[in-house]
């Protein structure tokens, strides 16, 4: 017998649907109406035929009371080819819900997103997470999607993007966005970062994650941030193959004084990179290839230094820096 496509946990909290049949019974998803977290995976199906069965232009206010009663706070939709018109129809209906985090993954969005009608209300998301989503509209996708969202978005995460650079002139500012995660875009690089960090569009950024994004030097990242006027408090550069030395012809870059936490773990470093901020609250250099304990003059002034998992550290070795947070145990790096 075929397994049920949807499973709801005993607490009515999480509901996961995997529609793998060529002709799925979408009505099975109705058992998820009581769930707070909902995941729907469409098995790579093309949802174009759906447009014939639903009126994407219908006034969503007719569903408002029903949708307001839903408990869903987190929604993940994955593995499908979705017409932009259908996506917009869903966003218009979800605008009446209590949805706070939307994750789209492994999706191919076809066609262009129509502009937001005057009477329509945007979706009040706190967090939008995109992983391996391709858009027919190329670089203008973020601007098109943004108009369907209220301006209170606080977290934007874009991984495995087919076009990680945005059409900056079309993008409006994100006044509430405190966290931007561009991790897992290995082709981004420092030039791509400059293109993605549209100047003055991210005025409230406090946390910036750039794991596995093809960054080469901390100084290069510093220059990209300075050019964009982005001043994060926390910067994650882990899982990049970083060079410790700076190109002598490159101009020196002054880090923003706002930066107090820097993650350089899993970066293949054989020495402490040059050009780090002068003062940090947290510096993570764990799981690198440091063969000797860093000298005080190589390090910024730092309260919490993590050096676990480097070759020079034998379990039980004395801590090399005041205020360090080494466990003395070499982690699995």
């Amino acid at each position: 017998t075929t397994p049920e496509p949807c499973e709801l946990d005993d607490e009515d909290f999480r509901c996961v649907c995997n529609f793998s049949e060529p002709q799925p019974d979408w009505s099975e998803a109705f058992q998820c109406v009581s769930a707070v977290e909902v995941e729907i995976h469409a098995g790579g199906l093309n949802l174009e035929p759906f447009l014939k069965r639903v009126d994407a232009d219908a006034d969503p206010r007719q569903y408002a009371d029903t949708v307001k009663a839903l408990r869903v706070r987190r929604l993940t939709v994955g593995a499908a080819q979705v017409p932009a018109q259908l996506l917009v129809g869903a966003l218009r209906v979800l605008a009446y819900s209590r949805l706070k985090e939307l994750t789209l993954e492994d999706l191919k969005i076809t066609g262009t997103m129509p502009p937001l009608p005057l009477e329509a209300t945007g979706l009040a998301l706190s967090s939008l997470r995109l992983r391996n989503v391709s858009w027919a509209t190329g670089r203008s996708w973020l601007a098109e999607l943004q108009q369907w969202l209220k301006p209170g978005l606080k977290v934007l995460s874009i991984a495995q993007a087919h076009s990680p650079a945005f059409s900056c002139e079309q993008v409006r500012a994100f006044p509430a966005l405190t966290s931007l995660d561009l991790s897992d875009n290995p082709g981004l690089g420092e030039r791509g970062l400059m293109a993605a960090l549209c100047p003055h569009k991210f005025p409230a950024i406090q946390n910036l994650a750039l794991r596995n994004t093809g960054m080469e030097t901390p100084t290069g990242v510093c220059a990209a941030l300075a050019a964009a006027g982005v001043q994060p408090h926390s910067l994650d550069l882990s899982h990049n193959s970083l060079r410790a030395t700076v190109n002598p012809s490159a101009p020196r870059c002054m880090w923003s004084s706002a930066l107090n936490s820097l993650n350089l773990s899993f970066a293949g470093l054989e020495q402490v990179p040059k050009g780090l901020p002068a003062k940090l609250r947290v510096l993570d250099l764990s799981c690198n290839r440091l063969n000797r304990a860093p000298q005080p003059d190589e390090l910024p002034e730092v309260d919490n230094l993590t050096l676990d998992g480097n070759p020079f550290l034998v379990p039980g070795t004395a801590l090399p820096h005041e205020g360090s947070m080494n466990s003395g145990v070499v982690p699995a790096c």
Epitope: R73, K100, S126, S127, K150, G152, P175, A176, D181, S234
Partner: nanobody, 122 residues
Framework: QVQLQESGGGLVQSGGSLRLSCAVS????????MGWYRQAPGKGRELVAE??????NYADSVLGRFTISRDNAKNTVYLQMNSLKPEDTAVYYC?????????????????WGQGTQVTVSS
């Protein structure tokens, strides 16, 4: 760990007023979205009012009667309830959306208070 402490509930006559307070035990208050929800006996929890960046949102049933405000210096959010009706009787819950704060930089996270009872008699 962020905790929310509500106060100000009680028994009031129809047409009367109450002011609910919600104190947040955290210094990240200034970037946190706050809201008030209520749950009447046998019903689901519904949004009453919320304060987010640059916008305030009210349930249709309380528009013009309830006002949400915040005091950043005291890490407190308030719900001023005027012209109360018997149908406003419910447990009122304070809600904080911590997404994007230092406590939850990259994922959605919210916390709820324990609730305060509001009873409106006719």
């Amino acid at each position: 760990q962020v905790q929310l402490q509500e106060s100000g509930g009680g028994l009031v006559q129809s047409g009367g007023s109450l002011r609910l307070s919600c104190a947040v035990s955290s210094s990240i208050f200034s970037i946190v979205d706050m809201g008030w929800y209520r749950q009447a006996p046998g019903k689901g929890r519904e949004l009453v009012a919320e304060l987010s960046v640059g916008s305030t949102n009210y349930a249709d049933s309380v528009l013009g009667r309830f006002t949400i405000s915040r005091d950043n210096a005291k890490n407190t959010v308030y719900l001023q309830m005027n012209s109360l009706k018997p149908e406003d009787t419910a447990v009122y819950y304070c809600n904080a959306d911590l997404t994007g704060s230092s406590l939850s930089p990259y994922r959605y996270l919210e916390v709820w208070g324990q609730g305060t009872q509001v009873t409106v008699s006719s």
